[in-house]
Structure formats: structure tokens, C-alpha cells
């Protein structure tokens, strides 16, 4: 962004911030705008919030358009009301393990986080918390209604998910590596963030991508065959140019997206992952991006409670990197 | 009413100094980027400078970056066009001017104060 | 960017259209695609005042008879009848991009 012009604004006036989110003028010193918050992608043009220590991580020099809103070396954590210190493990709850990192939090489930996908032996599955017991367990429900279960059962199949392996030992440094957190975005890119120590220095490093769990101009529940009530992963008719912050991606790409549901369950990534992307920007310069690639979706009912912090973050996640 | 009233125009010698003062009214300062114009005696409009809502941005004209300083008050509802190294060239009528920083630029004027250089 | 005006001076009578052309050195569009081309007048004795922004918009309480045309590096402003109270110079803008300049002026008068 060239700052060396006169300074003019969007005509509306100044944008209402959310609460918490600061108003301020954007890198160029011209124009009001609500900063970008821990995570999100950011621009010389949309800086970071300067009130919580945040600023844009460009990453290599020569991405120097677009970054993620990252917090200074050795900023604390507020989590779940609490502060932690930069490189502070703790247990949010018996179900997560959490790290901190430089204002980050990544989290490891302790639970398994498998998907149950409907089966013959198991159309309904459900999961429950038992007593006595931290982590859900899956049971299956009877069916209400007995003309649903068919033979159309035989187009689900159980899904497995692969994470990475927690007890992974090599040179004397433990590799643990956070599952990606859920998209920042439920349409349209967002980021996807993630902790780890799989590196020579077996030093701690937040990692980013950029996803799109689905287009936000697509009007998928149009698409949902009659008598379904979902669209897993829908067919996208033509390959297509990613968009990021006005520059465009030099190759097209057949991507999978996630599909919706009409009945309530919503379907997010199951399998992903993660390819460079390289992106051109109206002035020539080529910027490479990694990104989350969808390989399959699944619909189920843990979607986001905003009453659990834990399962908006991780029940959404996208499961099984297999970069 | 929307008002701009500038002020600390007069009489200066070549070398002086002046600072020009604009006290706005009727509108809520800091939304709003200020701006200076001027003209000289039967000559058309030249833009001097302009400031952003807090003052954190100037942008000046070329040849007079290096002797005017705008700056603003937002407590006050003021700005100011500081002068130094005055030269008869700088004679003219200085308006002070609201710019919109949106749509527009000069949406509201002040009537103008006189600087005069001449020994 | 050189803003130049023609004709420098326009002698109008009562009800007719008076048209004034304004030629930039260059393209004046603005790093976000926006043109900012604007239209001034000054009475005689008074400070100017703001008629058209952005190539075409008219300023608050401007009359419908000031209209301002024009894209790239050329651009007019009609009054399509011509007023008493309309007398005075004419200035054209652009602010997209530094120094931000005005054009020479145009003296509207009365016949």
C-alpha cells in the first residue's frame, strides 16, 4: 500500500467497533477503522490492534502485503479469565491440554475428537457425558422414525481421523504439535492457526493458514437433493481464484468446500491439507500463502456452543492434517 | 452553525514569523481532517496544507514543508498554520477550510485572515 | 497535476447555459478508484464555496442547474440557467492526487 497520496475514506462515516475492539487510523495514518484482532489477517491499510501489543507478522519479506494480527514476543495469555505466561502449559479442563505462546493459546484434546458418522449398526450416533466420566462417550439412538433407516445407510461409511502422533520423540525434543484451530471464517477466508515444536530448535511456533471452509456468495441449501437433509460436499461446478486482501491466486483451483444441513447439524473439514498458494497483487508482487485444502467434510451435531469455550475452538477444528 | 473563524493574520517582515489561528464551531472537531488554502492579491486558490482527525498525519505543500508546521488542538477546536521564514511571495488572504476526508475535500470555509510580508 | 480551465472569463446573459471546461495534466484518479474532481465558486468578496464533488455529486444545497460531467483528464461544469447570484469565479480541483491543485479560475459574468 503506497501511503504517499492523499488521504481519502470509505463516504460512510467512522465504523461502530465491536465491544473490546479498538477504532484506529490505519497504517497510513489516513482513514478510521476497527483494528484487527489476535489471529485475524491483516494489511498496512487494516493494522492490528496496538492496545492488546498486536502486530501485522508479515512472515517472509516478501509477503509483505498481508500478515496475521500476531502478539509481541512473550505477551501473556488471558484464557477461560486467567493470565498465563508465554511458554506456560496448562490443563483449561480435563479434556484439553493448552499452550501459551507469545499471546496465543493452542490447544491438545485429551478426549478423543473423532466424527461418528451415521452406519447401519449405528444411524443414530449421539455423544454423551456419563457421570463420573471427563470425556463423552459415543451412544447410539434409536431411530424415531423407522422408515428413515434403508438402504440409502449404505452411502455413509465411518470415517477415520489421523492427528499427529503426541509422543513423537526425535533428538532428545518431545514433538507436539496442536491440532488447527477451527477457521477464523464460517464462509469466505479466514485463518487457521496452530502451535508447535517440530522444528531443529524444538523451540515453540505458532503457524498459520489461510481456509475457506466454504464460499460466502454460494447458496448451498439450494443444492440439497430432495428428500436429503444435507450437502456434505458439494460439487463446485468450475475451478476458481482464491482472494486475498485484493490480490488474486496465479493458479485456479478445483477446491472442496463444506456443505450445509436444513436439520440443525453443520458440517465442517474433516480431513485437510495444507498447500503453498501463491497470490499476485494489482501492483505485480507475488506473495505465497499456505492454505488449508479440503480433502472431506463431515455434518454432525457438535457444532460451536457459545456456552463452551472449548468445543466453539475444538469441536470445529479441522481434523486430521495430512500435510 | 457550522463556523470557522481564523485569526493572527497582520503585518510581518520578510524573515518573521506569524501563526494563524482557526477556531471552529458547530460540528464535532476531531471527525473531521482540517485544511489551510490561500491566495494571493487577484490570484487564484493554492492549498497549503492539511491535518488528519488527531493530528498524527500532515501533508504540506512541497515548496513550503521546510518553513510552515500545521498542527491542531482537538481540545480547543483549533488549528494553526505556523509560519516561520516568511517571504513577500507568502502574502496572501489564508482560509482556513473543514475537509470532509470522505466524499469531498473543502466542504466549509472561513472568511479569511490577511498576511501581509513587505518591509 | 496542472488543472487548466477554459474559457478564463464568460459573459452570460440572464437564463442561458454556461458550460466551463477544466483539462488535467494527467489522470486524476485516485489510488482507490475514485475520481476527486471538484467544482468551486467564489463570489466577489466572499470565501469559495463547495458545488460539485467527485466528478458529479452536488455539494448540500447546491441547485439542480450546477452539474459537473467528465472522466480521466477532462471535465465540465454547466449551469443550465444561468442566475444573478451565479456571478464570480469558477474554480475546478483535483484531490487525488499531491499537491492537490487548483485550476486558474473562470470569471462568470452577467451580460
Known amino acids: 500500500q503506497n501511503c504517499s497520496g492523499p488521504c481519502r475514506c470509505p463516504d460512510e462515516p467512522a465504523p461502530r467497533c465491536p465491544a473490546g475492539v479498538s477504532l484506529v487510523l490505519d497504517g497510513c495514518g489516513c482513514c478510521r477503522v476497527c483494528a484487527k484482532q489476535l489471529g485475524e489477517l491483516c494489511t498496512e491499510r487494516d493494522p492490528c490492534d496496538p492496545h492488546k501489543g498486536l502486530f501485522c507478522d508479515f512472515g517472509s519479506p516478501a509477503n509483505r502485503k498481508i500478515g496475521v494480527c500476531t502478539a509481541k514476543d512473550g505477551a501473556p495469555c488471558i484464557f477461560g479469565g486467567t493470565v498465563y505466561r508465554s511458554g506456560e502449559s496448562f490443563q483449561s479442563s480435563c479434556k484439553y491440554q493448552c499452550t501459551c505462546l507469545d499471546g496465543a493459546v493452542g490447544c491438545m484434546p485429551l478426549c478423543s475428537m473423532d466424527v461418528r458418522l451415521p452406519s447401519p449398526d449405528c444411524p443414530f450416533p449421539r455423544r454423551v457425558k456419563l457421570p463420573g466420566k471427563c470425556c463423552e462417550e459415543w451412544v447410539c439412538d434409536e431411530p424415531k422414525d423407522q422408515t428413515v433407516v434403508g438402504p440409502a445407510l449404505a452411502a455413509y461409511r465411518l470415517e477415520d481421523t489421523f492427528g499427529p502422533d503426541p509422543t513423537m520423540i526425535r533428538a532428545n525434543c518431545l514433538v507436539q504439535t496442536t491440532e488447527w484451530s477451527a477457521c477464523s471464517k464460517t464462509c469466505g477466508m479466514g485463518i487457521s492457526t496452530r502451535v508447535t515444536n517440530d522444528n531443529a530448535s524444538c523451540r515453540l511456533e505458532k503457524q498459520s493458514r489461510l481456509c475457506m471452509v466454504r464460499p460466502c456468495e454460494a447458496d448451498l441449501e439450494e443444492n440439497i437433493k430432495k428428500g436429503k437433509k444435507c450437502i456434505r460436499t458439494p460439487k463446485i461446478s468450475k475451478p476458481i481464484k482464491f482472494e486475498l486482501s485484493g490480490c488474486t491466486s496465479m493458479k485456479t483451483y478445483r477446491a472442496k468446500f463444506c456443505g450445509v444441513c436444513t436439520d440443525g447439524r453443520c458440517c465442517t473439514p474433516h480431513r485437510t491439507t495444507t498447500l503453498p498458494v501463491e497470490f499476485k497483487c494489482p501492483d505485480g508482487e507475488v506473495m505465497k500463502k499456505n492454505m488449508m485444502f479440503i480433502k472431506t467434510c463431515a455434518c454432525h451435531y457438535n457444532c460451536p456452543g457459545d456456552n463452551d469455550i472449548f468445543e466453539s475452538l475444538y469441536y470445529r477444528k479441522m481434523y486430521g492434517d495430512m500435510a | 452553525e457550522v463556523q470557522l473563524v481564523e485569526s493572527g493574520g497582520g503585518l510581518v517582515q520578510p524573515g518573521g514569523s506569524l501563526r494563524l489561528s482557526c477556531a471552529a464551531s458547530?460540528?464535532?472537531?476531531?471527525?473531521?481532517?482540517m485544511a489551510w488554502v490561500r491566495q494571493a492579491p487577484g490570484k487564484g486558490l493554492e492549498w497549503v496544507a492539511n491535518?488528519?482527525?488527531?493530528?498524527?498525519?500532515?501533508d504540506l505543500l512541497a515548496s513550503l514543508k521546510s518553513r510552515f508546521t500545521i498542527s491542531r488542538d482537538n481540545a480547543k477546536n483549533s488549528v494553526y498554520l505556523q509560519m516561520n521564514s516568511l517571504r513577500a511571495e507568502d502574502t496572501a488572504v489564508y482560509y482556513c477550510a473543514r475537509d470532509t476526508s470522505r466524499g469531498s475535500y473543502f466542504d466549509v470555509w472561513g472568511a479569511g485572515t490577511t498576511v501581509t510580508v513587505s518591509s | 497535476v496542472v488543472m487548466t480551465q477554459t474559457p478564463l472569463s464568460l459573459s452570460v446573459s440572464l437564463g442561458d447555459q454556461a458550460s466551463i471546461s477544466c483539462k488535467s495534466s494527467?489522470?486524476?484518479?485516485?489510488?482507490?478508484?475514485?475520481?476527486?474532481l471538484e467544482w468551486y465558486l467564489q463570489k466577489p468578496g466572499q470565501s469559495p464555496q463547495l458545488l460539485i464533488y467527485k466528478v458529479s455529486s452536488r455539494a448540500s444545497g447546491v441547485p439542480d442547474r450546477f452539474s459537473g460531467s467528465g472522466s480521466g483528464t477532462d471535465f465540465t461544469l454547466k449551469i443550465s440557467r444561468v442566475e444573478a447570484e451565479d456571478l464570480g469565479v469558477y474554480y475546478c480541483f483535483q484531490g487525488s492526487h499531491f499537491p492537490l491543485t487548483f485550476g486558474q479560475g473562470t470569471k462568470l459574468e452577467i451580460k
Open positions: 494527467q489522470s486524476i484518479v485516485h489510488y482507490n478508484e475514485n475520481t476527486y
Open positions: 458547530g460540528f464535532t472537531f476531531s471527525d473531521y481532517y
Open positions: 491535518i488528519n482527525y488527531y493530528g498524527s498525519r500532515t
